[in-house]
């Protein structure tokens, strides 16, 4: 066992946090000011990321992980770790190449970030239109039009209130 | 050829202060991240102190916040910490360092002085 460690690379006994130092006969030397090393037997540490500008610091850097950012109120986080940073818009807008825009009619955001979604199409399912849609808010779907015949309705009506004191006839 | 020249360490009572200099050749401390590490009896390196982003900050191990403060004098390219309020656990061996950043996004430093030698004891 001592044989095979002996044999091994000096540098895998570098614990994060520290970088094995080639200048120093690879010992373990701790990692900089704003940098970092993750996993051991590093041969060098990485920068830590810095969050400027529209990004703001969610977690710290700190000798053995990275700095997260996300994104100052009004932007919200796209990509791998939060790596762009996208404006907010209103609900029933979506953000175009010119700003935030409304939705056109027949489609809707109910979020403050993507695109707008069309309505769903009740028709395809042979249901009707319970609620209409709007730039904020889907089409609710009520039941087909077949459900509707007279005596027939999958909408159960509300129960009659009663009178306190009154028992039900 | 870079050259760092570390001095004004030596034996202090607790409480006391020092001011350690780097005369450094070879690179201009204007221009670099520089700092000082330490290593005390039967430990490893560990950073005391830098000044980064060309002066735009300064760094400071936890425990010698409040009490150390670092500067350059650009005119003699050589940097200081001034130390105060000195505890024996501030005895160690004071290495000057340059922080390198390496083409493909590492970091690492150098130490090429012998260090200077601050004692904290009464």
């Known amino acids: 066992f001592e044989r095979t460690r002996s044999l091994q690379d000096p540098c895998s006994n570098c614990p994060a946090g520290t970088f094995c130092d080639n200048n120093r006969n690879q010992i373990c030397s701790p990692c900089p000011p704003n940098s970092f090393s993750s996993a051991g037997g590093q041969r060098t540490c990485d920068i830590c990321r810095q969050c400027k500008g529209v990004f703001r610091t969610r977690k710290e850097c700190s000798s053995t992980s990275n700095a997260e950012c996300d994104c100052t109120p009004g932007f919200h986080c796209l990509g791998a770790g939060c790596s762009m940073c996208e404006q907010d818009c209103k609900q029933g807008q979506e953000l175009t190449k010119k700003g935030c825009k409304d939705c056109c009619f027949g489609t809707f955001n109910d979020q403050k970030r993507g695109i707008c979604r069309p309505w769903t199409n009740c028709s395809l399912d042979g249901k009707s239109v319970l609620v209409n849609g709007t730039k904020e808010r889907d089409v609710v779907c009520g039941p087909s039009p077949a459900d509707l015949s007279p005596g027939a309705s999958s909408v159960t009506p509300p129960a009659p209130a009663r009178e306190p004191g009154h028992s039900p006839q | 050829e870079v050259q760092l020249l570390e001095s004004g360490g030596g034996l202090v009572q607790p409480g006391g202060s020092l001011r350690l200099s780097c005369a450094a050749s070879?690179?201009?401390?204007?221009?670099?991240?520089v700092g000082w590490v330490r290593q005390a009896p039967g430990k490893g390196l560990e950073w005391v102190s830098a000044?980064?982003?060309?002066?735009?900050?300064?760094y400071y191990a936890e425990s010698v916040k409040g009490r150390f403060t670092i500067s350059r004098d650009n005119a003699k390219n050589t940097l200081y910490l001034q130390m105060s309020s000195l505890r024996a656990e501030d005895t160690a061996v004071y290495y000057c360092?340059?922080?390198?950043?390496?083409?493909?996004?590492?970091?690492?430093?150098?130490?090429r002085g012998q260090g200077t030698q601050v004692t904290v004891s009464s």
């Open positions: 070879g690179f201009t401390v204007s221009a670099e991240d």
């Open positions: 360092a340059r922080i390198v950043y390496h083409a493909g996004g590492g970091v690492t430093f150098d130490t």
């Open positions: 000044i980064l982003d060309s002066g735009g900050s300064t």
